[in-house]
């Protein structure tokens, strides 16, 4: 109960919660988040833990078709949407069961993609034309990442890779790149 999903025509999955989870954060940027200066002990709060691994977050299954113009994958693909706040693992199930998200008073723990898997997808086109197969990268697991007071707004944007970071209010877009113009990390774009 509370985690049934409805697939609409756009193949989005809408969790049925007492209150809607926050939209999934942008993707993780390992380079930014792994810097030593982004560390530091979080402010004390009642559920403080020593290890982020003690926190968990919800992995919502998301089923959709891969499309390229009028062409669509023969079968839908399933990946995960990393959704909502993170809380201590021992508290999260009960909190979710009541349709409430546990919100820490100290640091903000965000639920973000952790591992990806690649999948080759065969597309089908109307009229029988034969398109090429495509490779997609799908979120395979989620993890909690701690945001401390050291993360200002511009640093928060770096949770998204350069490939997925919006610029000037525009939607996310891939980074132009060449061997002589290697700029930002693309690895986690999906």
């Amino acid at each position: 109960q509370g985690w049934q999903a409805f697939k609409n025509d756009a193949t989005e999955i809408i969790p049925e919660l007492g209150e809607y989870p926050e939209p999934p954060p942008e993707l993780e940027n390992n380079k930014t988040m792994n810097r030593a200066e982004n560390g530091g002990r979080p402010p004390h709060h009642p559920f403080e833990t020593k290890d982020v691994s003690e926190y968990s977050c919800r992995e919502l299954h998301f089923t959709r078709y891969v499309t390229d113009g009028p062409c669509r994958s023969a079968k839908p693909v399933t990946e995960l949407v990393c959704s909502g706040q993170c809380g201590p693992a021992r508290l999260l199930p009960n909190a979710i069961g009541r349709g409430k998200w546990w919100r820490p008073s100290g640091p903000d723990f965000r639920c973000i993609p952790d591992r990806y898997r690649a999948q080759r997808v065969q597309l089908l086109c109307p009229g029988g034309e034969a398109p090429r197969a495509r490779k997609v990268r799908l979120v395979a697991s989620c993890k909690c990442k701690r945001l401390t007071r050291f993360h200002n707004q511009s640093e928060l944007k770096d949770f998204g890779t350069e490939a997925a970071r919006p610029q000037k209010g525009r939607k996310p877009r891939p980074r132009a790149r060449s061997a002589k113009a290697n700029q930002a990390e693309l690895e986690n774009a999906y």
Partner: antibody, heavy 124, light 106 residues
């Protein structure tokens, strides 16, 4: 830093064999299609073929089918382009490129990462 | 094979002028991608999926079109924009590039 690093320039004689490489850095090539593109001196870009390093499946442009072989070793994240018998007309710059992907409600593919290019000169 | 024909082959313009590059496909394609190449460099992505500006690319670049006719527009040429531009289709094998348009300083 995500990049494709290609092997150095080659000078060969007609009839010789050659294998050039393209190594993925900070990403696994098995997760992407890796493409090879030829650019003859003063000319445009020509797509040669692609490989899925996960299982070695390849596709070639008709004009390059049987002329070159594309292969990969996913354990070292490296793709290869090879010739068994070079011709003077193979003189060109060869680029490898990664076909990137992301999804934001629509699916997008594009050549996002390019190698620096390998110059191959075939002359007697 | 989908043939992409770019025109003009060469465009001679001055900095500050507007550049309009055309790419025509021999049969309908879903999307066109545009790349810029400068001498001695690898190509780099400018516009993907017909009209989406790649990150890090200035807003003076824009793309449009559908079906068989596509356009890359540079609203006001900067000195660094003088280069060769290629269109590409990724939907059908064999993948193909246009022959390129060289934008040179008048």
């Amino acid at each position: 830093e995500v990049q494709l690093v290609q092997s150095g320039a080659e000078v060969k004689k007609p009839g010789e064999s050659l294998k050039i490489s393209c190594k993925g850095s900070d990403f696994e090539i098995k997760d992407y299609y890796i493409h090879w593109v030829r650019q003859m001196p003063g000319k445009g870009l020509e797509w040669m073929g692609q490989i899925d390093a996960e299982d070695g499946e390849t596709e070639y442009a008709p004009r390059f089918q049987g002329q070159v072989t594309i292969s990969a070793d996913k354990s070292i994240s490296t793709a290869y382009l090879q010739w068994s018998s070079l011709k003077a007309s193979d003189t060109a710059m060869y680029y490898c490129a990664r076909e990137g992907y992301y999804y934001d409600g629509r699916d997008y593919w594009y050549f996002d990462v390019w190698g620096q290019g390998t110059t191959v000169t075939v002359s007697s | 094979e989908i043939v992409l024909t770019q025109s003009p082959a060469t465009l001679s313009l001055s900095p500050g002028e507007r550049a309009t590059l055309s790419c025509s496909a021999s049969s309908s394609v879903s999307y066109i991608h545009w790349y810029q190449q400068k001498p001695g460099q690898a190509p780099r992505l400018l516009i993907y999926s017909t009209s989406e500006l790649a990150s890090g690319i200035p807003a003076r670049f824009s793309g449009s079109g559908s079906g068989t006719d596509f356009t890359l527009t540079i609203s006001s040429l900067e000195p660094e924009d003088f280069a060769v531009y290629y269109c590409q289709q990724l939907s059908h094998l064999p993948l193909t590039f246009g022959g390129g348009t060289k934008v040179e300083i008048k």
